[in-house]
């Protein structure tokens, strides 16, 4: 637990360089996020596709669309889990990281340094060991998120099922109903490629204990889109005086040392015969 | 035919309890949230908060964080509304609905016949 | 939360009359919703999404709006529409009902 309260941002004297000092695991070992890049990563053909099971949301169902300060959460039923890992790990909610319309490169893990330009994090907890996310966050093997990056491309309506509901949760503390939707939507293409390492929170209190599955290809949202995620939310309650915009809610990459990153997938990028006769 | 049906309301003591039951039939009952939604005399309707049955998450509304607990049976398709610490205030008739979508929001197009709660020393 | 004031909160009108109830929301909503409730009952879905009627109800009823102000309309009032409307929107936690405008008979 924090040793004074839960005050903490992304910029200024609460900003990620003071976390430590209320939350002692953020300078700890196992943080998060980290950059991806070749001379960590490491071949593992153990690594076999995830299952998302009960991740078709029925529009019949209402889920509580959150501001809470930091990012824009989306409440998740316990009922949706992944399959493939040791044990069952339940969904609690999604969230997003991004950058700000003058430098829109907000994503939290980098591949080769390069950031993208947003980051939803799906964030699930080891439902065979404990009954809910909060006991889960701080327990060895607790919990595991599924990283998707996000780069400015194409529209995506399957991301606009969240983003259409920002209006309605523009300050802290505000929530809106969202129909159910089919949350594999979210995921890019080929899931079966991805990059795993265990690794913390990335936000207060960085707990050091989440299996991370960072997917190796993007997904695409448009720059309409970026934009209004970067332009609708503020950090501050409705009634603040000095109100605070939502942008650069991402951490840092943290040291990665002595340790591995292992994909299930071989490095090669196979190209693709487009536009070769 | 789709219905809901309520019970358990009645005379309760100030600072007493009350758990309602909601039977629902007619319909996939793990498909649709359960909503108790109330009814103060003379007032308009007020929402306390649902359940999904599937799973048996919950969602209040923060006036009633602490003092209403929703719960379910998927054995007897029933949705059960405890509340404690009761007051006056909470004399109300107690309705369960069912949202249903229609393609861009919802709406309660199914309501039980409401159980009157009466909290009177 | 969102408040919902409806206007008026109660009016007389004879059969035949136009009658039209306003709600208007303290935030702006995606949609209203619309629910009809006769004493002693329980309500009953009359117009979803701002102008949808629910089924079984007659096309002499309407609703329209947008943003925060939304009404609901009565072209020609029937014996059977004397009752009590509330508005309702599921845009934002914890969803509100108006307080309702009760139709009497003049």
């Known amino acids: 637990a924090p040793v004074n309260g839960s005050k903490w941002t992304y910029f200024g004297p609460d900003g990620e360089n003071s976390w430590s000092k209320k939350y002692p695991s953020c300078g700890g070992l196992l943080q998060s996020p980290i950059d991806l890049h070749s001379d960590i990563l490491q071949y593992d053909a153990s690594l076999t596709p995830l299952e998302f099971q009960g991740y078709n949301l029925s529009a019949n169902k209402q889920f509580l669309l959150t501001n809470n300060g930091h990012s824009v959460k989306l409440n998740l039923p316990s009922d949706m889990h992944i399959q493939g890992l040791q044990s069952r790990y339940s969904a609690t909610q999604l969230h997003l990281h991004w950058g700000n319309p003058n430098d829109p490169h907000g994503s939290e893990h980098t591949v080769s340094g390069q950031h993208f330009a947003a980051e939803l994090h799906i964030v699930h907890y080891n439902s065979d060991l404990y009954p809910d996310a909060s006991t889960a966050s701080n327990k060895s093997e607790g919990l595991a998120v599924l990283a998707v990056l996000i780069e400015m491309g194409s529209f995506n309506p399957s991301y606009d099922k969240i983003f259409s509901h920002l209006q309605h949760v523009k300050y802290k503390g505000q929530e809106a109903f969202v129909p159910g939707f089919n949350i594999e939507e979210l995921l890019p293409e080929r899931t079966a490629e991805y990059y795993r390492y265990r690794g913390s929170l990335t936000t207060p209190p960085c707990n050091p204990t989440v299996l991370w599955t960072v997917f190796r290809n993007p997904v695409q949202i448009s720059q309409e889109q970026l934009l209004a995620l970067e332009t609708a939310l503020y950090c501050t309650h409705m009634d603040d005086p000095s109100p605070r915009e939502m942008i650069n809610n991402f951490r840092q990459v943290q040291k990665f040392d002595e340790r591995l990153v292992y994909t299930s997938f071989s490095q090669v990028q196979v190209c693709t015969a487009a536009g070769l006769s | 035919e789709v219905q809901l049906v309520e019970s358990g309301g009645g005379l309760v003591q100030p600072g007493g309890s009350l758990r309602l039951s909601c039977a629902a039939s007619?319909?996939?009952?793990?498909?649709?949230?359960i909503y108790w939604v109330r009814q103060a005399p003379g007032k308009g309707l007020e929402w306390v908060g649902y359940?999904?049955?599937?799973?048996?998450?919950?969602t209040y509304n923060q006036k009633f964080k602490g003092r209403a607990t929703i719960s379910v049976d998927k054995s007897k398709n029933t949705a059960y509304l405890q509340m404690n610490s009761l007051r006056a205030e909470d004399t109300a008739v107690y309705y369960c609905?069912?949202?249903?979508?229609?393609?861009?929001?919802?709406?309660?197009?199914?309501w039980g016949q409401g159980t009157l709660v009466t909290v009177s020393s | 939360d969102i408040q919902m004031t409806q206007s008026p909160s109660s009016l007389s009108a004879s059969v035949g009359d136009r009658v039209t109830i306003t709600c208007r929301a303290s935030?702006?909503?995606?949609?209203m919703h619309w629910y009809q409730q006769k004493p002693g009952k329980a309500p009953k879905p009359w117009i979803y999404?701002?102008?949808s009627l629910a089924p079984g109800v007659p096309s002499r009823f309407s609703g329209s709006g947008s943003g925060t102000d939304f009404t609901l309309t009565i072209s020609s009032l029937q014996p059977e529409d004397f009752a009590t409307y509330y508005c309702?929107?599921?845009?934002?936690?914890?969803?509100?009902f108006g307080q309702g405008t009760k139709v009497e008979i003049k």
């Open positions: 935030s702006p909503v995606t949609y």
């Open positions: 007619g319909y996939s009952y793990t498909d649709y949230n």
């Open positions: 999404a701002t102008s």
């Open positions: 609905s069912r949202p249903i979508y229609y393609g861009a929001y919802w709406y309660f197009d199914v």
């Open positions: 309702q929107q599921w845009s934002s936690n914890p969803l509100t």
């Open positions: 359940i999904d049955p599937a799973n048996g998450d919950t």
